[in-house]
C-alpha cells in the first residue's frame, strides 16, 4: 500500500480548525495478523529524507497521538489528552487518516508528517509517510478560511519508506 | 511594494561568526518564509535554510546544520543568518529571498551581503 | 538528495538565435523554476512551476518539461538575455542547478 497527500500546503488563518489528511492507496490486508498503527508528528524543512526527524504536535508526541487497529476499521485518538491539546486523530473505513486542530495559532506552522505502519504479527512491518506543510497567517492578507493546495500528482503518489 | 534590504559587507578571521540581517518591508512579514542562499566567487547558488517568521520554525540544508542559526525579530521585521567557524571556503555573497506561499520559488530577494573570511 | 545537472554549461549565440537550455533531475521533481543572474546583481525569477511565466518577463522566454528533464528556451536572444541562467527545484529540501552560462557569440 503506499500513502496520498491530497494537498501539500494548508494556509490558515489564526484561530481556525484545520483537518489535514492522508490517504491510505493500494490493497489492504484485512487478515487477522495485520494490525495498522497510524501517527502524526511535526517534521523539519530542509531534510534530505523527508519525515526524518520527529517533533510533538502542540507537546503530544507520535506516541500520543497514534491509532492501533485492523484493516479498514475506523478508529479515533483517546480523548482526553489529545482533546484537552485541541488535537484528534481519527481513520475511517475508506483509508482516510486525518489530525484535527483546533484554534491555531502561529506556532503551529510547520511541516506534518502522517505514518502508517503495517504490523504483521510475527513477520517485519511495513511503513510509510506523507508529509504536508501547514501555514498559519495573520493580519490583513491571512485568508479568511484555510486553504489549500493540492499535491502535484507525482507528490500525492510519492512515498518514501521510513 | 516589497523589499528586502541587506545589511553591508563584512570581513572576518576563520574560526569567527557573521551575523547578516535582511529587513524586509511591504508585506505582512510573519506569513512568507525566508530563505537564505549564498554564492561563492564565480560559483553557483547554494541553499542554506529558511525561517518562518509567524513562529521561527527553521529548515537548513544538511550541510550548514550546527553552523548555521536563523532567527527573526518581528518588532522590526527582519530576519537573521548567524554562520559560526567560518573558513575561507565561506567566502561567498548571501541573500536572503522571500519564498511565495505555496510555490515553493523566491519572488523577491535581497540586494545580496559579501562576507570575507580571510586571516 | 536530488542533483540537478544544467547543460550545457557555455552556452554561446549571437542575438536573434534560439536558445535552449536543458536541467536534468536525479529523480522525479515536483516543482522546477529559473532564474536569470547578471554580473553583480541578485537573481530573477524567469519561470516558474516548470512553465509559467513570472511578472515582468518577455514573452520569448518559456519553459517545459515534467518529472526529470526540463527546457528552458530563449526564442529569439536580445542583448539583454545574455546571464547566467539557474534551474531551481524543491522537493522537501531545495537545489539548484550548477547554472549555464550565456555568452555572446
Known amino acids: 500500500f503506499k500513502v496520498a497527500t491530497p494537498y501539500s500546503l494548508y494556509v490558515c488563518p489564526e484561530g481556525q480548525n484545520v483537518t489535514l489528511t492522508c490517504r491510505l492507496l493500494g490493497p489492504v490486508d484485512k487478515g487477522h495478523d495485520v494490525t495498522f498503527y497510524k501517527t502524526w508528528y511535526r517534521s523539519s524543512r530542509g531534510e534530505v529524507q523527508t519525515c526524518s526527524e520527529r517533533r510533538p504536535i502542540r507537546n503530544l508526541t507520535f506516541q500520543d497521538l497514534h491509532l492501533h487497529h485492523g484493516g479498514h476499521q475506523a478508529a479515533n485518538t483517546s480523548h482526553d489528552l489529545a482533546q484537552r491539546h485541541g488535537l484528534e486523530s481519527a481513520s475511517d473505513h475508506h483509508g482516510n487518516f486525518s489530525i484535527t486542530m483546533r484554534n491555531l495559532t502561529l506556532l503551529d506552522s510547520g511541516l506534518y508528517c502522517c505514518l502508517v505502519v503495517e504490523i504483521r504479527h510475527h513477520h517485519s512491518e511495513h511503513r510509510v509517510h506523507g508529509a504536508m506543510e501547514l501555514q498559519v497567517q495573520t493580519g490583513k492578507d491571512a485568508p479568511s478560511n484555510c486553504v489549500v493546495y493540492p499535491s502535484s500528482s507525482q507528490d500525492s503518489e510519492n512515498i518514501t519508506a521510513a | 511594494q516589497v523589499q528586502l534590504v541587506q545589511s553591508g559587507a563584512e570581513v572576518k578571521k576563520p574560526g569567527a561568526s557573521v551575523k547578516v540581517s535582511c529587513k524586509a518591508s511591504?508585506?505582512?512579514?510573519?506569513?512568507?518564509?525566508m530563505h537564505w542562499v549564498r554564492q561563492a566567487p564565480g560559483q553557483g547558488l547554494e541553499w542554506m535554510g529558511a525561517?518562518?517568521?509567524?513562529?521561527?520554525?527553521?529548515g537548513y540544508n544538511q550541510k550548514f546544520k550546527g553552523r548555521v542559526t536563523m532567527t527573526r525579530d518581528t518588532s522590526t521585521s527582519t530576519v537573521y543568518m548567524e554562520l559560526s567557524s567560518l573558513r575561507s571556503e565561506d567566502t561567498a555573497v548571501y541573500y536572503c529571498?522571500?519564498?511565495?506561499?505555496?510555490?515553493?520559488?523566491?519572488?523577491?530577494w535581497g540586494q545580496g551581503t559579501l562576507v570575507t573570511v580571510s586571516s | 538528495e536530488i542533483v540537478l545537472t544544467q547543460s550545457p554549461a557555455t552556452l554561446s549565440l549571437s542575438p536573434g538565435e534560439r536558445a535552449t537550455l536543458s536541467c536534468s533531475a536525479t529523480?522525479?521533481?515536483?516543482?522546477m523554476h529559473w532564474y536569470q543572474q547578471k554580473p553583480g546583481q541578485a537573481p530573477r525569477l524567469l519561470i516558474y512551476?516548470?512553465?509559467n511565466l513570472a511578472s515582468g518577463i518577455p514573452a520569448r522566454f518559456s519553459g517545459s518539461g515534467s518529472g526529470t528533464d526540463f527546457t528552458l528556451t530563449i526564442s529569439s536572444l536580445e542583448p539583454e538575455d545574455f546571464a547566467v541562467y539557474y534551474c531551481?527545484?524543491?522537493?522537501?529540501?531545495?537545489?539548484f542547478g550548477q547554472g549555464t552560462k550565456l555568452e555572446i557569440k
Open positions: 511591504g508585506y505582512t512579514f510573519a506569513n512568507f518564509w
Open positions: 529571498a522571500r519564498e511565495l506561499t505555496g510555490t515553493y520559488y523566491f519572488d523577491y
Open positions: 529523480s522525479s521533481v515536483s516543482y
Open positions: 525561517i518562518f517568521p509567524g513562529n521561527s520554525d527553521t
Open positions: 512551476s516548470s512553465s
Open positions: 531551481h527545484q524543491w522537493s522537501g529540501h531545495f537545489t
